[in-house]
């Protein structure tokens, strides 16, 4: 795979021999679009090109993560003279073209947003008729997905010397602040771990030593809301039982 910005054939320069329109290849995308998880977002992308009145076959492509090499999340193709761009790929069926590529608009709608959609997206157009030419946005649009906190895991685990520790993992954007409360604890921020590499929206808080039986509650909060979950510690006959 050659990481090229544009692949061209030799005949593309003759399109301007007799006229010199001011347009050249360019793409316009905003730096960032924000939306809440569960909602839909529109990723705007418009372009200009030097091939006047191009009416041949074209393909519109969106990719995620990185330009030129990132995985495609959407692709559609329009036949010569057609304004209908037939979808060939829509990852999980959630991506839909809003714009009309014939009118230099590749804007994309993303449905049912999840935190995993928080990435940079790059639009690309390919001409494949008398003219072979293509162009891809180099800087892309960052889709910033926000979400109220959700506790994805809460558990009690054995520690050395017959002790127990509790772990609470939550997701959200902005990353939520976690606090533990429980017997003889009051409220404690309890060793919050930074978001992990590749899991930027996950935050974990550990309660290193559970000294009393009872209910331990983890609360996750950010500017969009709060969530809580509890575990119960009962020690009997030297063993432990934990339930949520």
């Amino acid at each position: 795979f050659v990481r090229t910005k544009i692949d061209t054939t030799e005949n593309l320069l003759n399109t301007e021999v007799h006229s010199s329109p001011a347009q050249r290849w360019s793409m316009q995308v905003p730096p960032e679009v924000s939306a809440e998880a569960g909602d839909a977002a529109v990723l705007p992308c418009t372009f200009t090109h030097p091939h006047r009145h191009y009416d041949g076959p074209l393909t519109a492509i969106w990719r995620a993560g990185e330009p030129y090499a990132g995985p495609q999340v959407f692709r559609c193709a329009a036949a010569r003279g057609s304004e209908l761009c037939q979808t060939a790929l829509s990852l999980h069926g959630r991506f839909r073209l809003l714009g009309n590529p014939r009118r230099n608009d590749l804007s994309l709608r993303v449905e049912r947003l999840a935190l995993a959609d928080d990435r940079r997206y790059f639009c690309r157009v390919e001409f494949a008729g008398d003219v072979h030419d293509r162009y891809e946005s180099r800087h892309g649009v960052r889709l910033h997905v926000t979400a109220a906190p959700r506790i994805v895991n809460i558990s009690v685990l054995p520690s050395p010397a017959h002790a127990f520790r509790a772990l609470c993992t939550a997701e959200g954007e902005p990353p939520p602040a976690l606090a533990w409360s429980g017997p003889a604890l009051g409220n404690s921020l309890a060793a919050v771990r930074s978001p992990r590499e590749g899991h930027g929206h996950l935050v974990t808080a550990e309660l290193p030593a559970l000294t009393h039986d009872g209910r331990y509650t983890c609360t996750a909060a950010n500017s969009l809301g709060r969530s809580e979950a509890s575990v119960y510690l009962f020690r009997f006959h030297g063993a432990s039982g934990a339930s949520t």
Epitope: R3, S20, R24, Y68, R138
Partner: antibody
Framework: QLQLQESGPGLVKPSETLSLTCAVS???????WSWVRQPPGKGLEWIGE???????TYKPSLKSRVTISVDNSKNQLSLKLTSVTAADTAVYYC???????????WGRGTMVTVSS | SSELTQDPAVSVALGQTVRITCRGD??????ASWYQQKPRQAPQLVIY???NRASGIPDRFSGSISGNTASLTITGAQAEDEAAYFC???????????FGGGTKVTVLG
């Protein structure tokens, strides 16, 4: 504000490898970055570029000798040019591409002389 | 050709208008950017894309493009505009960047 600072040895022997780094401060490294060089008294020559995701493109005539990489954790990029000759003597600049093919921020440049 | 060609030198009287050109087949497809470089300094972006002035650039600088030629015009040249000016764009394949050879602008008077 965003600043770029190139660093590396000012003198490299012929046939050896030229290694330079560019420290990015005052902003995220999330962008496209290029290395450009300028031989004494001459014009600018684009060497290649790297995206913060690791994607690279190089000038074809230099491609066999050049490697550009990015270290997101250190907020820096690097240039390696192998098998250097006197023709590689130049001021080497790193620059940020803020819009397609347009560089708005440049480092001050570092002079590299290839000589035995 | 993937080259961008500039005239090596041009002079202009103080307060007058000067036009610097950059020629190349790739300019039929891609916009050019323009940079000013003073002695012992790094280049500074002046104009990018169709005719966008970079931050802090006076409005006496403007850009245009027609056919295979991009132009940088300085209307009412000042003494501080004396510098080398370089254009850049993609090559005809679009796969990599090229710079013009540069034009040395001398402001007289």
């Amino acid at each position: 504000q965003l600043q770029l600072q190139e660093s590396g040895p000012g003198l490299v022997k012929p046939s050896e490898t030229l290694s330079l780094t560019c420290a990015v401060s005052g902003a995220s490294i999330s962008n496209w970055w290029s290395w450009v060089r300028q031989p004494p008294g001459k014009g600018l020559e684009w060497i290649g570029e790297v995206h913060h995701s690791g994607v690279t493109t190089y000038k074809p005539s230099l491609k066999s000798r050049v490697t550009i990489s990015v270290d997101n954790s250190k907020n820096q990029l690097s240039l390696k040019l192998t098998s250097v000759t006197a023709a590689d003597t130049a001021v080497y600049y790193c620059a940020r591409e803020f819009a397609d093919d347009a560089f708005d921020i440049w480092g001050r440049g570092t002079m590299v002389t290839v000589s035995s | 050709s993937s080259e961008l060609t500039q005239d090596p030198a041009v002079s202009v009287a103080l307060g007058q208008t000067v036009r610097i050109t950059c020629r190349g087949d790739s300019l039929r497809k891609y916009y050019a950017s323009w940079y000013q470089q003073k002695p012992r300094q790094a280049p500074q972006l002046v104009i990018y894309h169709k005719n966008n002035r970079a931050s802090g650039i006076p409005d006496r600088f403007s850009g245009s493009i027609s056919g295979n030629t991009a132009s940088l015009t300085i209307t009412g040249a000042q003494a501080e505009d004396e510098a080398a000016y370089f254009c850049n764009s993609r090559d005809t394949s679009g796969n990599y960047l090229v710079f013009g050879g540069g034009t040395k602008v001398t402001v007289l008077g």
